[in-house]
């Protein structure tokens, strides 16, 4: 039994016509089976195949070989979490957040917790200790005063 | 064994909008899309639209642009459909079908009466 | 829009009589066509799909034929279940458009 063109089986009751749009994107093989074009996938052919890499939580595709990030996600693969605008010495797990890094602390990770480290103001042999963020005291040596020991 | 459940029947008045649901049950729901179908009474059946219920990217007959919206709920398998602005010719049973070759599977309809 | 001219809009027929039903569409739609059966107060139900293919558990007394423009629904021997109302749709391209039905009566 010869079938109609685009259908295939036996008894010709299966039904396979290439297609290219909303429906889906597919050639037919011999035995009237879909397959799908390069770069999509599914049982109708519908879904891209996202670029390689592209994290399956955060980021998606309508297109193969895209990678469309997620609100609050970013970067090539979608897998970088955006920190809270305005971080400054600070990361994030998940989108929004801002974790200090050592010896930085307040909401933007903007204050600085080891200030005798980052800056060296004791000045003279002066002994710096921190006292708060962004804040220090000097302890001066014999012979010398002032905030930074410089007098 | 592939079912799809609708909401139950709606009352409204003219202008109000209405939203049915589509519970689905018993296949992958991001596997196939949902179309919408109406019947007035006596009268013949409608295509709405369609939703791919994987992106959630919709198409609608021109008749309804505009005043439909269709909508999927991936956590729960339901899609939804909401017509706007209603009139008394929506007076009608909606019917949500699973298929891309004609469809074989339909829900029992819902019908929305829009009266004064 | 693809129109569809479903035909005729209504018949009367008896038990054991040989039917047929016709869609026509505005163009060339290939093989997308789809018949459905549907009784009062039910949801339709798929009897054949890509113009000629019978969907599993639909009687061989339905019988699908046609491409491109001109479609044929035939029951072969009418049985006391088939009186109901058959529709046509095509399912080539958005929208999918119905044909207007043939109202299938007892004689």
């Known amino acids: 039994v010869t079938c109609d063109d685009y259908y295939y089986g036996f008894g010709c009751n299966k039904f396979c016509r290439p297609r290219d749009d909303f429906f889906g994107h597919y050639a037919c093989d011999q035995n009237g089976n879909k397959t799908c074009m390069e770069g999509w996938m599914g049982p109708e052919c519908n879904r891209a195949i996202c670029r390689q890499g592209c994290s399956p939580k955060h980021g998606s595709c309508k297109l193969p070989g895209d990678c469309r990030c997620q609100y609050g996600w970013q970067g090539l693969y979608c897998d970088k979490c955006i920190p809270h605008p305005g971080c400054v010495h600070g990361i994030c797990n998940e989108p929004w957040q801002c974790l200090c890094e050592t010896n930085w602390g307040g909401q933007l990770c903007d204050k600085d917790l080891n200030y005798c480290g980052t800056h060296q103001p004791c000045l003279n042999g002066g002994t710096c200790s921190n006292t708060g963020p962004d804040k220090y005291q000097c302890s001066c040596p014999e012979g010398y005063s002032g905030p930074n020991c410089e007098i | 064994q592939v079912q799809l459940v609708q909401s139950g029947a709606e009352l409204k008045k003219p202008g109000a909008s209405v939203k049915v649901s589509c519970k689905v049950s018993g296949y992958a729901f991001t596997d196939y899309a949902i179309h919408w179908i109406r019947q007035a009474p006596g009268q013949g059946l409608e295509w709405m639209g369609i939703i791919n219920t994987y992106y959630g990217d919709s198409k609608y007959a021109q008749k309804f642009q505009g005043r439909v919206t269709m909508t999927v709920d991936t956590s729960t398998s339901t899609a939804y459909m909401e017509l706007s602005s209603l009139r008394s010719e929506d007076t009608a049973v909606y019917y949500c079908a699973r298929g891309y070759d004609g469809f074989a599977y339909w829900g029992q309809g819902t019908l929305v009466t829009v009266s004064s | 829009d693809i129109q569809m001219t479903q035909s005729p809009s209504s018949l009367s027929a008896s038990v054991g009589d040989r039917v047929t039903i016709t869609c026509r569409t505005s163009e060339n739609i290939y093989s997308y066509l789809t018949w459905y059966q549907q009784k009062p107060g039910k949801a339709p139900k798929l009897l054949i799909y890509?113009?000629?293919i019978l969907d599993s558990g639909v009687p061989s007394r339905f019988s699908g034929s046609g491409s491109g423009t001109d479609f044929t629904l035939t029951i072969s021997s009418l049985q006391p279940e088939d009186f109901a109302t058959y529709y046509c749709?095509?399912?080539?391209?958005?929208?999918?458009?119905f044909g207007g039905g043939t109202k299938l009566e007892i004689k």
């Open positions: 749709q095509h399912h080539y391209d958005i929208p999918w458009t």
């Open positions: 890509n113009a000629k």
